[in-house]
Amino acid sequence: ELCDDDPPEIPHATFKAMAYKEGTMLNCECKRGFRRIKSGSLYMLCTGNSSHSSWDNQCQCTSSATRNTTKQVTPQPEEQKERKTTEMQSPMQPVDQASLPGHCREPPPWENEATERIYHFVVGQMVYYQCVQGYRALHRGPAESVCKMTHGKTRWTQPQLICTGEMETSQFPGEEKPQASPEGRPESETSCLVTTTDFQIQTEMAATMETSIFTTEYQ
């Protein structure tokens, strides 16, 4: 089941999904002056079995001025992500998100991709919030949001995070990269009220994106 809305926005904070649940789709979008190759994939899809998840399909962009003479091919996600996990082994790195059953890593960059990535999340997806540089976190609870199905409708839980402008000289409290858990924390809410937050769509993207069969935006 796809999530209807975008995760909520918090002032002076930004969010990311550290891993993507199976069923997540990522649109293959190209930046201005480039387009998907003919017969190229419209989207990547996180698929897998009980032991391994990966992105099906590859996004490929080519210059709009050429006739597919130069194909720009994305690196194999599995290949890149394997390098990612073996090259960077240190205590400051959290538990490898790729080890989450039923989840895919962030696909590596592909040549001439669009600025924004348009993901289509599924129920159970979690995103994690951090205060941006120059702000520090005041936690009232988990700095995360999970897409849940409630009474037949999807909604994102509200992250309990406030970012205050008190500058820290080095690290910012509350900014540690989270260890993702596949399922969201249980909530005490029982109301069926569904709240949505409009995602701030950057106008530049609207001007540069080619028309897509999908519309939900997440960067």
Partner: nanobody
Framework: QLQLVESGGDLVQPGGSLRLSCTAS????????IGWFRQAPGKEREGVSY????????YYIDSVKGRFTISSDIAKSTVYLQMNTLKPEDTAVYYC???????????????????????WGKGTLVTVSS
């Protein structure tokens, strides 16, 4: 295949300067944080500096503040690390890396410090010794 290619590493005397380059042809800069990590022999890799392609905001690890400067030339698909007043403790292999920005084109320095990047270069060696 999109790759990160570093150059500029060398042997330099303490107090000297170097400029590292990282070229990422085809990378859509304004969707990423791009910058540098380093790993000294027997030590953990650490995030040195990054610049965001969306708005040019920068980050430096405390030990290099005031000595290192990161910049980018999007037309050349290249990020630079100008390293001045080099010290022996700056000796390391320097790796270029990129990480996807968060929502609204913003980025949190903790993501860089975690070292969990989307793409890595092969590294260039900087040796500071007399």
């Amino acid at each position: 295949q999109l790759q990160l290619v570093e150059s500029g590493g060398d042997l330099v005397q303490p107090g000297g300067s170097l400029r590292l380059s990282c070229t990422a042809s085809g990378l859509t800069f304004d969707g990423y944080a791009i910058g540098w990590f380093r790993q000294a022999p027997g030590k953990e890799r650490e995030g040195v500096s990054y610049i965001t392609g969306s708005n040019g905001s920068t980050y430096y690890i405390d030990s290099v503040k005031g000595r290192f400067t990161i910049s980018s030339d999007i037309a050349k698909s290249t990020v630079y690390l100008q390293m001045n007043t080099l010290k022996p403790e700056d000796t390391a292999v320097y790796y270029c890396a990129v990480d996807r920005l968060g929502s609204r084109g913003l980025y949190a320095s903790s993501w860089w410090r975690s070292g969990d990047m989307d793409l890595w270069g092969k590294g260039t060696l900087v040796t500071v010794s007399s």
